[in-house]
C-alpha cells in the first residue's frame, strides 16, 4: 500500500525517503521512478544515485537533503496536475531481494485562487507564485524564483518592504537582479 502526500499546482512537492548508511560514506544506490515499485529497479526513472553521486536526474526532480547522510527525499519542482500518481523510492541494498521499496502517492490539488490585493503590501501579494517551497518538508524555508521586471516607481517601496524581511537574504542568495527602467 502507498502513503499519500499532497501538494498544490505551482508548489514544490516533497516525497520523503531515507535510509541509514551502514557506515559513513558507505552509500547504496537509490532510484526514484514514476509508477509503483516493480520487482526490480524503478520504472520511468526520474532520478538515480550510485555509491558516490547523483548520476542521473531529469529536470524539476532533485534531492534537497544530503543523500550522503541517507536523506534521499525527492523534491519535484513547480508541480502540475500531470505529476499526480505513484512514485517509487527504491533503496538498492546489496543482496538478493534486499531492496527497501516505498510507494508514495502524490496528489496534486488545483492552486487556490486568491483575489488580487487592493494594496501591494507584501512581497508575495505583489508577485504571486514567485515563492516556491524548497526544502525539507511542507511549509519550509522559502526561496525566490526568477524576479519579474520591476520599474523605478516600485523600487523604493520594494526595498522598504524587504529591508526587515528574511526575503532580503533569499533575494541575495538567489542571485536575482533588479532591472531598472
Amino acid at each position: 500500500s502507498e502513503v499519500e502526500y499532497r501538494a498544490e499546482v505551482g508548489q514544490n512537492a516533497y516525497l520523503p525517503c531515507f535510509y541509514t548508511p551502514a557506515a559513513p560514506g558507505n552509500l547504496v544506490p537509490v532510484c526514484w521512478g514514476k509508477g509503483a515499485c516493480p520487482v526490480f529497479e524503478c520504472g520511468n526513472v526520474v532520478l538515480r544515485t550510485d555509491e558516490r553521486d547523483v548520476n542521473y536526474w531529469t529536470s524539476r526532480y532533485w534531492l534537497n537533503g544530503d543523500f550522503r547522510k541517507g536523506d534521499v527525499s525527492l523534491t519535484i519542482e513547480n508541480v502540475t496536475l500531470a505529476d499526480s500518481g505513484i512514485y517509487c523510492c527504491r533503496i538498492q541494498i546489496p543482496g538478493i531481494m534486499n531492496d527497501e521499496k516505498f510507494n508514495l502517492k502524490l496528489v496534486i490539488k488545483p492552486a487556490k485562487v486568491t483575489p488580487a490585493p487592493t494594496r501591494q503590501r507584501d512581497f508575495t501579494a505583489a508577485f504571486p507564485r514567485m515563492l516556491t517551497t524548497r526544502g525539507h518538508g511542507p511549509a519550509e524555508t522559502q526561496t525566490l524564483g526568477s524576479l519579474p521586471d520591476i520599474n523605478l516607481t516600485q523600487i523604493s517601496t520594494l526595498a522598504n518592504e524587504l529591508r526587515d524581511s528574511r526575503l532580503a537574504n533569499d533575494l541575495r542568495d538567489s542571485g536575482a537582479t533588479i532591472r531598472i527602467g
Epitope: V3, E4, Y5, Y14, P16, F18, T20, P24, G25, G65, D66, R68, K69, G70, D71, F102, L104, G135, H136, G137, P138, E140
Partner: antibody, heavy 117, light 107 residues
C-alpha cells in the same frame, strides 16, 4: 565508541547570551546531521534545530528562529548552540544529538542552563 | 508543522503486564517515526526507529508498529526498569516534532 560530550552547567542573567558546546568522539560530525533539543523541568522534549556540519546549513523550529544559532567547527568536531536575549523561559536542559538521518541514535549528557538575576 | 499527539499522558500498570502507547501524526509520516525512553534524571535513549525496527541492545519486550498517521509502542511483560517517560518523534519533515510523552508508573 561514539560519544557526545557537552559543556558544563551555566547560570546567566536575563538579557545575556550563552554558547553551549557539544564535542563528538568516535565519529566525524561531517557525516551526520547534528541537532539540539531542549527540555524544561518536568516537561517534554522540544526540537530546536539542526546543522549539516559539512556545509553549515541549518534548520530551526519557528519558535527558536532568532533565539537560537547553531554552528559547527569540523576541525574540533564540535557543534555549538548560541542562545540570545535570555529569559527565565529559557531555563532548561539542552541536549545535542546525532541523527541517522531521521532518528536520534546518540545523545549528549545534557547541559543545564539557568537564567536568573 | 506536523503535530504528534501521544496518549495516554500517564499510565499505571503492574509488573508483567503488557502496555500500549499510541502516537497520532497530524499528517502522514509514512514510517519515519521513532520512540525514545527517558528514565528519571537520565538522557533520552532510542528504542525503535522506522516505526518498528528495534535499536541495538533494546530488549525484545519492546515493539513498535504503524504507518502513515497511527503508531503504537508495546511493552510486554513489564519490568521495574521500564519506569520512564516515553516519547514518539517524527523525522520526516522539519521542524521535527515530539509527542507530549507518556509517563509510565508501576502499580
Amino acid at each position: 565508541e561514539v560519544q557526545l560530550q557537552q559543556s558544563g552547567a551555566e547560570l546567566v542573567k536575563p538579557g545575556a547570551s550563552v554558547k553551549l558546546s557539544c564535542t563528538a568522539s568516535g565519529f566525524n560530525i561531517k557525516d551526520f546531521y547534528m541537532h539540539w533539543v531542549h527540555q524544561r523541568t518536568e516537561k517534554g522534549l522540544e526540537w530546536i534545530g539542526r546543522i549539516d556540519p559539512e556545509d553549515g546549513k541549518t534548520k530551526y523550529a519557528p519558535k527558536f528562529q532568532g533565539k537560537a544559532t547553531i554552528t559547527a567547527d569540523t576541525s574540533s568536531n564540535t557543534a555549538y548552540l548560541q542562545l540570545s536575549s535570555l529569559t527565565s523561559e529559557d531555563t532548561a536542559v539542552y541536549y545535542c544529538a546525532r541523527s541517522n538521518p531521521y532518528f536520534f541514535d546518540y545523545w549528549g549528557q545534557g547541559t543545564t542552563l539557568t537564567v536568573s538575576s | 508543522d506536523i503535530q504528534m499527539n501521544q496518549s495516554p499522558s500517564s499510565l499505571s500498570a503492574s509488573l508483567g503486564d503488557t502496555i500500549t502507547i499510541t502516537c497520532h501524526a497530524s499528517q502522514t509520516i509514512n514510517v519515519w517515526l521513532s520512540w525514545y525512553q527517558q528514565k528519571p534524571g537520565n538522557i533520552p535513549k532510542l528504542l525503535i526507529y522506522k516505526a518498528s525496527n528495534l535499536h541495538t541492545g533494546v530488549p525484545s519486550r519492546f515493539s513498535g508498529s504503524g504507518s502513515g498517521t497511527g503508531f503504537t509502542l508495546n511493552i510486554s511483560s513489564l519490568q521495574p526498569e521500564d519506569i520512564a517517560t516515553y516519547y514518539c518523534h517524527q523525522g520526516q519533515s522539519y521542524p521535527y516534532t515530539f509527542g507530549g510523552g507518556t509517563k509510565l508508573e508501576i502499580k
